[in-house]
Amino acid sequence: QPSVSPGEPSPPSIHPGKSDLIVRVGDEIRLLCTDPGFVKWTFEILDETNENKQNEWITEKAEATNTGKYTCTNKHGLSNSIYVFVRDPAKLFLVDRSLYGKEDNDTLVRCPLTDPEVTNYSLKGCQGKPLPKDLRFIPDPKAGIMIKSVKRAYHRLCLHCSVDQEGKSVLSEKFILKVRPAFKAVPVVSVSKASYLLREGEEFTVTCTIKDVSSSVYSTWKRENSQTKLQEKYNSWHHGDFNYERQATLTISSARVNDSGVFMCYANNTFGSANVTTTLEVVDKGFINIFPMINTTVFVNDGENVDLIVEYEAFPKPEHQQWIYMNRTFTDKWEDYPKSENESNIRYVSELHLTRLKGTEGGTYTFLVSNSDVNAAIAFNVYVNTKPEILTYDRLVNGMLQCVAAGFPEPTIDWYFCPGTEQRCSASVLPVDVQTLNSSGPPFGKLVVQSSIDSSAFKHNGTVECKAYNDVGKTSAYFNFAFKGNNKEQIHPHTLFTP
């Protein structure tokens, strides 16, 4: 009982004057509160309360459920308590089976006793299974058993409160512990595609996958630099305990150009936040953009190979591709493939493989591509470099020596005179006339050059060399002269290839 200090309000006194009282089931509970300023009795068990305004609390036939704390309070707010145990061999525990634990926190198994004189008040696993080795608990007969520092591994642990009564173990009803995990990492977020390209009116749909330990994770789709609420749909799954997955799908049923922008999937928990973005580009119509991977003017040596390569962006997907030369379509020698296997790829590569090109195969090679919205083309001008070929070398009636050579690039013709029998022709002779002739072949073909010198300048026997050359090579033709009296005679002309 409380001690009284004169002049100060004192707490009420309770009869019987003990802190704990044990009664048998069926017996009477009679508690008297003495205080001039009596206000109420309060009864509390399993954290539920009942009140009584009578100063004497009487329960004629006590039941196990009358076990609990009885508190008398006066008008000064001072109180005094007695704890009553109603001993019932058939009901040793009062229980509230709701049992939730937060990871790393303590949680109370609410199984207060109706008899404080039983022994070995503890927890036991269901069906004889042992409790986890690291599970620690503190029993309190008036409240229950406190599990210390709940672990994630205890989730859905089945247990009983247990006591020994007269040498026998008695178990309470089952409790199933539901553990709420602590967030110890940020959510994991991913998006179905990093970028989307659509035409106006098409549906935009993107899915964000959020993974975390529980469904308490928060997630939302946001449009960057906008407060507009976005319409989302959700699917979620628990892949076993503490492995939660949510799919948040954002849909714009008919996308417009001004819907273009960056969309962010944001998720957070008490540990932190994570986000991932996707970019939407909406175009009013499809497009094709072609990028040559080599110069569109191509020079290649006779007999060599060349690859004409383009990359192109096409949206929607390309439907027809072809390579054309001289109004003829190539059926083979070319390949077309996507630049990447990525689902959102819009970039493609096309390669035309030209092998052992002849001088006659120069010209315009055109790549054409189309999709459902547009057509596009690119042309390559291919020049085949050929060493000069001397087409004609003649002594004309007017006494001129004429040499006609063809090649690409345009050949240069030089003339040389070798007196007598000398093999080396070093003395150069200036031409009288040089002309570039129009080729009768296709454009991009060989260029024809005609050069003439006046043979009357030669007064001695010897050889005249016509030498045609360009970047690729050179070719010579020779005129042999012999004087018989006053007459100059052309002996058989011949050509000599000089590499």
């Epitope: 509390e44 954290d47 009942n50 089976r97 709701s98 926190n105 269901c126 089945c158």
Partner: antibody
Framework: QVQLVQSGAEVKKPGASVKVSCKAS????????MHWVRQAPGQGLEWMGV????????SYNQKFKGRVTMTTDTSTSTAYMELRSLTSDDTAVYYC??????????WGQGTLVTVSA | EIVLTQSPSSLSASVGDRVTITCRAS??????????MHWYQQKPGKAPKLLIY???NLESGVPSRFSGSGSGTDFTLTISSLQPEDFATYYC?????????FGQGTKLEIK
């Protein structure tokens, strides 16, 4: 004698927020989980979420994600449920319910929230 | 989420009739022998009232004509002899897994 007494009816405009209160008595407020359930006119019951005893942790039905916040004021033994960005679909009676021994043993009388332009 | 499907959706019966309402869950709501399935009664303009908890336990103060049975995914609420005050809507509810869910309800009407 456990009692849950809820705040009165509310009329709100679309886009606004509402905060419903639930004052508890007859038990130790911090020892029991408080759930919120709503019922649209002529429709069934829909669980919105729970605020757990002690820690004040919450778990929400994902349908209401980002729009709902559940809180408590332990000094007055009152639970609150705030719902934001209201639309006409949120017109409903909102109930608080105390979880006891695995079930919803005690319910508030309900709060009608009408969302109308 | 666990989907609960009640049948029938509505039912006409007379005072004194025996009535059975079923609730089927899309997945089991059992754990360690407990079925986390409960039954509630709701009258117009009133809050739901708990009748049966953990599938078969009668809530204190509820008349004994109400009973519940079942486990796993199939559950039944039975009213052995209908009384006039029993005409109401009945809901099953699971709290084995979040989000907790309710059946769509069974409206019991006077024939």
């Amino acid at each position: 004698q456990v009692q849950l007494v809820q705040s009165g009816a509310e009329v709100k405009k679309p886009g606004a927020s509402v905060k419903v209160s639930c004052k508890a008595s007859g038990y130790t407020f911090t020892s029991y989980n408080m759930h919120w359930v709503r019922q649209a006119p002529g429709q069934g019951l829909e669980w919105m979420g729970v605020i757990y005893s002690g820690s004040g942790d919450t778990s929400y039905n994902q349908k209401f994600k980002g729009r709902v916040t559940m809180t408590t004021d332990t000094s007055t033994s009152t639970a609150y449920m705030e719902l934001r960005s209201l639309t006409s679909d949120d017109t409903a009676v909102y109930y608080c319910a105390r979880e006891r021994d695995t079930r919803f043993g005690n319910w508030g009388q309900g709060t009608l929230v009408t969302v109308s332009a | 989420e666990i989907v609960l499907t009640q049948s029938p959706s509505s039912l006409s019966a007379s005072v004194g009739d025996r009535v059975t309402i079923t609730c089927r869950a899309s997945e089991s709501v059992d754990i360690y022998g407990y079925s986390f399935m409960h039954w509630y009664q709701q009258k117009p303009g009133k809050a739901p009232k708990l009748l049966i908890y953990l599938a078969s336990n009668l809530e204190s103060g509820v008349p004994s004509r109400f009973s519940g049975s079942g486990s796993g995914t199939d559950f039944t609420l039975t009213i052995s002899s209908l009384q006039p005050e029993d005409f109401a809507t009945y809901y099953c509810q699971q709290n084995n897994e979040e989000p907790y869910t309710f059946g769509q309800g069974t409206k019991l009407e006077i024939k």
